[in-house]
Interface confidence: medium
């Protein structure tokens, strides 16, 4: 066995093993997505997190899982069976994914102001329509999760929620905000989380009440709600995690480039090996 053949064999099995790993990973992701879709309650108790945007994540996980499994399967079978068409398709898919990531990166860096504004507009709409439309629960769950995780409330200020007529206090009642705005670690007073489902929400019946992230809490005068708006919270989060984000993106990009190089190398050199083998026969 020549050096070239052993090198190709090594590449072949390397591609196979790594893609097998990604195939398993993809199927796990897909299973998680399906689990959430089928049985939310058991997943929530398993994860033990409040305000998880399950509706969006279930679909994101399922689609990501299928996509990862698909690409990994192409790499696995293509490498193991030495099928040029599958390896070519695998390379093409990775190239497409890589190009998409590069394009996104360029768009994010050049269109930052527009992206920020678009995000603000989406958040504003979510805040203004909060609790009124059963179809909008995915966006609401996601925003609740952001507020809960980043320990912030509203976009600019917590008072952004007061603009929403449905959440406005009537008469001398306190203003209301979603419960995800509450800093639970700042108080041990359980009465402060006096959950209020407004009359306007009650007409939505079970749908509005079934998910705890839609719970609305009264704001006492000296309430323990997060004082910071999420615009600042997101900026801080991005600033603090910039190295990690860039590192992950670079890592994923390099991994893709590596697999693309190996697959095209294997694809191009399969012919030479077959020709040589044919001569020896």
């Amino acid at each position: 066995m020549s050096a070239q053949e052993s090198c190709l064999s090594l590449i072949k099995y390397f591609l196979f093993v790594f893609n097998l790993f990604f195939f398993v990973l993809g199927s796990l992701i897909f299973c998680f997505g399906i689990w959430i879709l089928i049985d939310k309650t058991s997943f929530v108790s398993f994860v033990g997190l409040a305000f998880v945007p399950l509706q969006i994540w279930s679909k994101v996980l399922a689609i990501s899982g299928i996509f990862t499994m698909g690409i990994a399967l192409l790499g696995c079978v293509g490498a193991l069976k030495e099928l040029r068409c599958l390896l070519g398709l695998y390379f093409g898919m990775l190239l497409l994914l890589f190009a998409t990531q590069i394009t996104l990166g360029i768009l994010i860096s050049t269109q930052r102001a527009q992206l920020e504004r678009s995000l603000r507009d989406v958040v504003e709409k979510t805040i203004q329509k909060y609790g009124t439309n059963p179809e909008e629960t995915a966006a609401e769950e996601s925003w609740d999760y952001v507020q809960f995780q980043l320990r912030c409330c509203g976009w600019h200020y917590p008072q952004d929620w007061f603009q929403v007529l449905i959440l406005r206090g009537n008469g001398s009642e306190a203003h209301r905000v979603p419960c995800s705005c509450y800093n639970l670690s700042a108080t041990n007073d359980s009465t402060i989380l006096d959950k209020v489902i407004l009359p306007q929400l009650s007409r939505l019946g079970h749908l509005a009440r079934s998910r705890h992230s839609a719970d609305i809490c009264a704001v006492p005068a000296e309430s323990h709600i997060y004082r910071e708006g999420c615009a600042q919270g997101l900026q801080k989060w991005l600033h603090n995690n910039l190295i990690s984000i860039v590192g992950i993106c670079l890592g994923v990009g390099l991994l893709e480039l590596g697999f693309m190089t190996l697959s095209i190398f294997l694809c191009r050199n399969l012919d030479h090996v077959y020709n040589r083998l044919a001569r020896y026969r």
């Epitope: 504004r117 600019h156 200020y157 008072q159 203003h175 615009a231």
Partner: antibody
Amino acid sequence: QVQLVQSGAEVVKPGASVKVSCKASGYSFTDYNMYWVKQAPGQRLEWMGYIDPYNGDTTYNQKFKGRATLTVDTSASTAYIELSSLRSEDTAVYYCARSPYGHYAMDYWGQGTLVTVSS
Amino acid sequence: DIQMTQSPSSLSASVGDRVTITCKASQDVSTAVDWYQQKPGKSPKLLINWASTRHTGVPSRFSGSGSGTDYTLTISSLQPEDFATYYCRQHYSTPFTFGQGTKLEIK
């Protein structure tokens, strides 16, 4: 930190025009509306209008519509108010102030620009 | 236009006093009321928004309350730096309107 720095005092003749600038720093300029408020000597504050720097959309107080024009230069993070056909009753301090939305409080203010209309 | 009527127009008080300024709207403004403090030669400063929420960095002695058409600003214990003019404003509907101001003076 958030800062709104306005142009210096102006003395103009009746019938003339004046353009007051307000340079913003310390925040994302297009993310906040810019309000303009008038305060004539010894008078209450008067809301003139606001502009959304992101798309240039303006909302005016009918009292000032036609004589006040709000504009922005997003590249310079600067808002402007142009007052035309000036009269003696336009003598006042003009403030710019930022607000997260149209129907909201003005959380940061410029130092004010005194415009004196005198012949 | 919604009229905002402040009372009193001026008041004298001493350091340590509890002071209440009221603002009456000509129609229901649904808690869309701010309070501003202005010192001579200075620009106004936001104290309270949405009728009862203190702005960042505003001392806890300042509090706001009210609903419908009646709103109040209370200073629980006057400090020397609190002597200024106070304005209420409605942002419920355009044109946004301010009260005529309440001048708080040292007795």
